[in-house]
C-alpha cells in the first residue's frame, strides 16, 4: 500500500508554449501522479522526471500561449494545486490602413493572436516616443481594429499593441505611420503678363515643405519648393493671357495633401 | 488485500429509502477517495457520485440522476462508506458497488467491491 | 456532462484475431481514460488507464491508444477468456462517465 506523500513546490516558470514545474517530496518515499489540465484540454498525466533524491520534476512543450493550465500531484486523495499560465502572443501582423489615413486619424489593424487572448491594448506614442492615446479593446474574432482620432496632421507616429490574457501580458510589437498633412489655405493669386505671385495660408498641423507646381495640360511647365515657413511663391517667364493648373502641395511625414487652382497670365 | 464489502440492499417500495453501507480494509481508508457506481439488470455502468478525504472537507460529486435524493458520506473511525437513498425510483433497481479509486505513481487505480442489489418495486 | 459513446455495440471475433474498440467524448478529456472488463456476475475489472497505461496483471495483448475526445482499446490477438462486456470511462470531469457498453463475443 503506497503512503501518502508530503510535497512542496520547488519551482514553477512559464513562456508562450512551455511550462516547468519542479517540486520535493518531504520525508520517505511515496506514490503521486501529476496531473494537469486546461478548460479545453481535459486531464492528463505529466511525465515527470527524477532532478535527484527528493526533487521530481515535468516539462510540457507545444501548449496554447495565454492559456490558463492546473496542475495536480496527487497521492492517494492529498494534493496541491499549482496554477500556471503560458504568456501570450502579440498579433503576427500588425499595420496602418494607409488608405484610411487622414489629417487627423490613423487606423490600425492587426491578426488575432495565436492561443487566448482577452484583450488587446493599442497605445500611440509621438515621435518623441511619448505616450498619446492608448486604448484596451477586447478581443474579437471579427473585429481586429482601431481608428485613432484628433491627431496632429502632418505627423510621425508609432503604435505599439500588446495581447493581454488573464493577468499575463505578452511583448509589443510596434508599426508606425503618419497623418496626412494639411492642405494650405486661402490660395491668393497676384498676376502679371510674365509672372504669377502666389501667396497662401497654412493649414494645421505639421509641413516639413511646400512645393509649387504650374501645369500646363498635364505637363510641369515650371516648379518650385519652399521651406515649411514660407507663405508666397513667385513663378517668372510666363506666357502671357494664358490659363495654367496651379497646384500648391504640402509635404510632411513622407506623404502630401494639395490644393489646386487654374490661373491666367495677364495679357499683354 | 484491498476489500470492499457492501451491504444493505434489499426490496423498497418507490418513494422509500434505503441506505448502503461499505466496509473497507486493507488500505489507508481516510487517505482515499470513494465512489458508488451502480448497474441496473442487464445494462451497463452508471457512474453515481463520489466522495473525497477529509483534507478535501469531505467534498461530494453526484451523477444529475441522483442529485439531490443520495446522499454519501463516510466514517473514517470505522473505515466505512454510505450511499443515503431517498425517494427512491424503479429505475434505481440496480447491482450498487463500492469503489475507491487513487491516484500514486502516475496511476489512477479503482479497486470494486462485489456489489449489494437492490430492488425498487411496488 | 461529458457523453462516452463506445462502438459498436457488439462485436464478434475469431479466436487468434484483433478485436478493437473504440470510445468517443463528447468534449476533450485529455487522456483521462479508463478501460474495464466485465464478465457475468462479476465486479468489473480495470484493464487500462491514462488511455494507454495496463494495469499490473493486464496481459499485453491489450492496449489502449487515443487523447482529447478519440480512444480506442485493442486486443491483439483474441483468447477465449476475453469474451466480456467492456466499457470506456472518463475521469477527467465531474461527472465521471461510463460508455454504455461492448459485448465481445467469438465468431
Known amino acids: 500500500e503506497p503512503e501518502r506523500c508530503n510535497f512542496t513546490l520547488a519551482e514553477s516558470k512559464a513562456s508562450s508554449h512551455s511550462v516547468s514545474i519542479q517540486w520535493r517530496i518531504l520525508g520517505s518515499p511515496c506514490n503521486f501522479s501529476l496531473i494537469y489540465s486546461s478548460d479545453t484540454l481535459g486531464a492528463a498525466l505529466c511525465p515527470t522526471f527524477r532532478i535527484d533524491n527528493t526533487t521530481y520534476g515535468c516539462n510540457l512543450q507545444d501548449l496554447q500561449a495565454g492559456t490558463i493550465y492546473n496542475f495536480r500531484i496527487i497521492s492517494l486523495d492529498e494534493e496541491r494545486t499549482v496554477v500556471l499560465q503560458t504568456d501570450p502572443l502579440p498579433p503576427a501582423r500588425f499595420g496602418v490602413s494607409k488608405e484610411k489615413t487622414t489629417s487627423t486619424s490613423l487606423h490600425v489593424w492587426w491578426t488575432p493572436s495565436s492561443g487566448k487572448v482577452t484583450s488587446y491594448e493599442v497605445q500611440l506614442f509621438d515621435e518623441n516616443n511619448q505616450k498619446i492615446q492608448g486604448v484596451q479593446i477586447q478581443e474579437s474574432t471579427s473585429w481586429n481594429e482601431y481608428t485613432f482620432f484628433n491627431l496632429t496632421a502632418g505627423s510621425k507616429y508609432n503604435i505599439a499593441i500588446t495581447a493581454v490574457s488573464g493577468g499575463k501580458r505578452s511583448f509589443s510589437v510596434y508599426t508606425n505611420g503618419s497623418t496626412v498633412p494639411s492642405p494650405v489655405k486661402d490660395i491668393g493669386i497676384s498676376t502679371k503678363a510674365n509672372s504669377l505671385l502666389i501667396s497662401w495660408s497654412h493649414g494645421s498641423g505639421n509641413v516639413e515643405r511646400y512645393r509649387l507646381m504650374l501645369m500646363d495640360k498635364g505637363i510641369l511647365v515650371h516648379g518650385g519648393v519652399v521651406d515649411k515657413h514660407a507663405t508666397s511663391y513667385a513663378f517668372h517667364g510666363l506666357t502671357p493671357g494664358y490659363l495654367y493648373n496651379l497646384t500648391v502641395m504640402t509635404e510632411a511625414a513622407g506623404l502630401q495633401n494639395y490644393r489646386w487652382k487654374l490661373v491666367r497670365t495677364a495679357p499683354m | 488485500e484491498v476489500q470492499l464489502v457492501e451491504s444493505g440492499g434489499g426490496l423498497v417500495q418507490p418513494g422509500g429509502s434505503l441506505r448502503l453501507s461499505c466496509a473497507a480494509s486493507g488500505f489507508t481508508f481516510n487517505a482515499n477517495a470513494m465512489n458508488w457506481v451502480r448497474q441496473a439488470p442487464g445494462k451497463g455502468l452508471e457512474w453515481v457520485g463520489r466522495?473525497?478525504?477529509?483534507?478535501?472537507?469531505?467534498?461530494?460529486y453526484y451523477a444529475g440522476s441522483v442529485k439531490d435524493r443520495f446522499t454519501i458520506s463516510r466514517d473514517d473511525s470505522k473505515n466505512s462508506l454510505y450511499l443515503q437513498m431517498n425517494s427512491l425510483k424503479t429505475e434505481d433497481t440496480a447491482v450498487y458497488y463500492c469503489?475507491?479509486?487513487?491516484?500514486?505513481?502516475?496511476?489512477?487505480?479503482?479497486?470494486w467491491g462485489q456489489g449489494t442489489l437492490v430492488t425498487v418495486s411496488s | 456532462d461529458i457523453v462516452m459513446t463506445q462502438s459498436p455495440d457488439s462485436l464478434a471475433v475469431s479466436l487468434g484475431e484483433r478485436a478493437t474498440i473504440n470510445c468517443k467524448a463528447s468534449?476533450?478529456?485529455?487522456?483521462?481514460v479508463a478501460w474495464y472488463q466485465q464478465k457475468p456476475g462479476q465486479p468489473p475489472k480495470l484493464l487500462i488507464y491514462?488511455?494507454?497505461t495496463r494495469h499490473t496483471g493486464v496481459p499485453d495483448r491489450f492496449s489502449g491508444s487515443g487523447s482529447g475526445t478519440d480512444f480506442t482499446l485493442t486486443i491483439s490477438s483474441l483468447q477465449a477468456e476475453d469474451v466480456a462486456v467492456y466499457y470506456c470511462q472518463q475521469y477527467s470531469s465531474y461527472p465521471f462517465t461510463f460508455g454504455q457498453g461492448t459485448k465481445l463475443e467469438i465468431k
Open positions: 466522495i473525497r478525504t477529509k483534507s478535501n472537507n469531505y467534498a461530494t
Open positions: 469503489v475507491r479509486d487513487y491516484y500514486g505513481s502516475s496511476a489512477w487505480i479503482t479497486y
Open positions: 491514462w488511455a494507454s
Open positions: 468534449q476533450h478529456v485529455g487522456t483521462a
